[in-house]
Interface confidence: medium
């Protein structure tokens, strides 16, 4: 574990004080359980205005995740609702709590709201694999121009230290099955590839076991071969986004050609109420291109700071080289500012976190 | 062995631009996931990355001083050029070339790009001075 | 980008352990790679991939790298580890470097 590093199982409806600034407390629930973070004030002054993010993306409120500036609150948890969660400012988008929350399977037993015995109920002594960084593990596809290196990785944990072995297409991975075989690093839970050609691609599969369980998680690797050809946008990027009013929103599209690509972020607008031009085309105003002193890498991002009602649409990535075009377009939704958590129970009394 | 030695002008006058060519042995900037970079090094402060070109002239320059960098590669030569406009002397600095490797993985928005520099070059001191 | 943040400064007593930390946000999930610079010298490569040694390095160097913090461990330092310590990792598609730490032994 690394310095600041604790894990926690909590048991139902258990309330956990958020860490200090700049550790990352890692929690584990059972599936059914209701998790409810907390992040009190630094030093207990003021707060001002919070958004809580999971993964990188604004928390959408609803009936089953109840946000508050202090409290986040998510009823009936799964396994979905593993990852990343960090409370932040919402105007300097400080972190000022961040937790990783893992959702078992099993749900937690008994009612203890401080869940300080429950930790033989569900097996963190001795227990069956899990992500280390779930949030992390969520990009499935790797496209990797041709000859370059690869190196994909599963970090997991379990105690027994579970076992790591690789699958390509659904069968045993070694190294004799590749020219210039791999490198398997179990100490990084990592499969390494140097100069992958076109006949590398395919789904490869890390199977992480010990004796209580086995997890396992496909990535597909395509393999780009540098023939002339329009430029591909990595698939399911730029990704939608939904924010609330007033945070920043990143949009990141990746781009890959061999002919020196053209890159531009295009916001879809109406005009005279209408989405298209008489020829279909739709209408758009260009947010961002490149310039003299524009790099490719940083025309890969398309960065929307304190966003108001009027941001939210469709945002189009356009990439050109000489041989055609290419485009990617994802939505933003816009939120509006949620100050306090205030939810109605069966009796009909309020609260407010 | 691999090895690697820059070169370039001790002092320059404010505005003017500098040239540095790294020229190297023991390894061929055409090998894959192989590529050389610029990390230059104020008196008594910190390693500060400025440029790389990879093996397939891919370039990559440091945020703040993107407007400035040119980097540059002539494989027949093994030598990489690195050209910074309008310098000041602030700029003033040992700037070393290295060889890296780098790698494609998965990152928090799809493939990202890793690197580690294994051999460096002694460092030229280059100061900014009227 | 990611921001890589060392101590200034470590100290140790010769044969005991030092330990140099290098935190940025989920450096754990990139590798970490470790640099040694002493006065008027170039720096050395000691640690990549978070934990592997390259040819010629001391068995008392060794690394780690897991939530966000890479650590470098020296076993049975000795007077000639003293130097300037660096780590580096990479973000969306840059090299990032740390402050460095100075590392007295005393």
């Known amino acids: 574990e690394s310095l600041g590093t604790e894990q926690r199982v909590v048991g139902r409806a258990a309330e956990v004080p958020g860490p200090e600034p700049g550790q990352q407390e890692q929690l584990v629930f059972g599936s059914g359980d209701a998790v409810e973070l907390s992040c009190p004030p630094p030093g207990g002054g003021p707060m001002g205005p919070t958004v809580w993010v999971k993964d990188g993306t604004g928390l959408v409120p609803s009936e089953r995740v109840l946000v508050g500036p202090q409290r986040l609150q998510v009823l009936n948890a799964s396994h979905e609702d593993s990852g990343a969660y960090s409370c932040r400012q919402r105007l300097t988008q400080r972190v000022l709590c961040h937790f990783s929350v893992r959702v078992t399977d099993a749900p937690s037993s008994g009612d203890d709201e401080d869940g300080e015995d429950e930790a033989e109920d569900t097996g963190v002594d001795t227990g069956a694999p899990y992500w280390t960084r779930p949030e992390r593990m969520d990009k499935k596809l790797l496209a990797v121009p041709a000859a370059n290196t690869v190196r994909f990785r599963c970090p997991a944990a379990g105690n027994p230290t579970p076992s790591i072995s690789w699958l390509k297409n659904g069968r045993e991975f070694r190294g004799e099955h590749r020219i210039g075989g791999i490198k398997l690093r179990h100490q990084q839970w990592s499969l390494v590839m140097e100069s992958v050609v076109p006949s590398d691609r395919g789904n490869y599969t890390c199977v992480v076991e010990n004796k209580f369980g086995s997890i396992r998680q496909t990535y597909t690797l395509d393999v780009l071969e540098r023939s002339p050809h329009r430029p591909i946008l990595q698939a399911g990027l730029p990704a939608n986004q939904t924010a609330v009013l007033g945070s920043d929103v990143e949009f990141h599209c990746k781009v890959y050609s061999d002919a020196q690509p053209h890159i531009q972020w295009l916001k879809h607008v109406e005009v005279n109420g209408s989405k298209v031009g008489p020829d279909g085309t739709p209408y758009v105003t260009v947010l961002k291109t490149a310039g003299a002193n524009t790099t490719d890498k940083e025309l890969e991002v398309l960065s929307l700071h304190n966003v108001t009602f009027e941001d939210a649409g469709e945002y189009t990535c356009l990439a050109g080289n000489s041989i055609g075009f290419s485009h990617h377009s994802a939505w933003l939704v816009v939120l509006p500012a949620e100050e306090e958590l205030v939810e109605a129970d069966e009796a009909g009394s309020v609260y407010a976190g | 062995q691999v090895q690697l030695k820059e070169s370039g002008p001790a002092l320059v006058k404010p505005t003017q631009t500098l040239t540095l060519t790294c020229t190297f042995s023991?390894?061929?900037?055409?090998?894959?996931?192989?590529?050389v970079g610029w990390i230059r090094q104020p008196p008594g402060k910190a390693l500060e990355w400025l440029a790389l070109?990879?093996?397939?002239?891919?370039?990559y320059y440091s945020t703040s001083l993107k407007t400035r960098l040119t980097i540059s590669k002539d494989t027949s030569k093994n030598q990489v050029v690195l050209t910074m406009t309008n310098m000041d002397p602030v700029d003033t600095a040992t700037y070393y070339c290295?060889?890296?490797?780098?790698?494609?993985?998965?990152?928090?928005?799809?493939?990202?790009?890793?690197?580690?520099?294994?051999?460096w070059g002694q460092g030229t001191l280059v100061t900014v001075s009227s | 980008d990611i921001e890589l943040t060392q101590p200034p400064s470590v100290s140790v007593a010769p044969g005991q352990t030092a330990r140099i930390s290098c935190s940025g946000d989920?450096?754990?999930?990139?590798?970490a790679s470790w640099y040694q610079q002493k006065p008027g010298q170039a720096p050395v490569l000691v640690i990549y991939?978070?934990?592997d040694r390259p040819s010629g390095i001391p068995e008392r160097f060794s690394g780690s790298n897991s939530g966000n913090t890479a650590t470098l461990t020296i076993s049975g330092t000795q007077a000639e580890d003293e130097a300037d310590y660096y780590c580096?990792?990479?973000?969306?598609?840059?090299?990032?470097f740390g402050g460095g730490t100075k590392l007295t032994v005393l």
């Open positions: 290295a060889r890296y490797h780098s790698w494609y993985e998965m990152g928090y928005y799809g493939s990202t790009v890793g690197y580690m520099f294994d051999y």
């Open positions: 023991g390894f061929s900037l055409s090998t894959s996931g192989v590529g």
């Open positions: 070109i990879d093996w397939d002239d891919d370039k």
């Open positions: 989920a450096l754990g999930d990139k590798y």
């Open positions: 991939d978070d934990s």
């Open positions: 580096q990792s990479y973000d969306f598609d840059f090299a990032v």
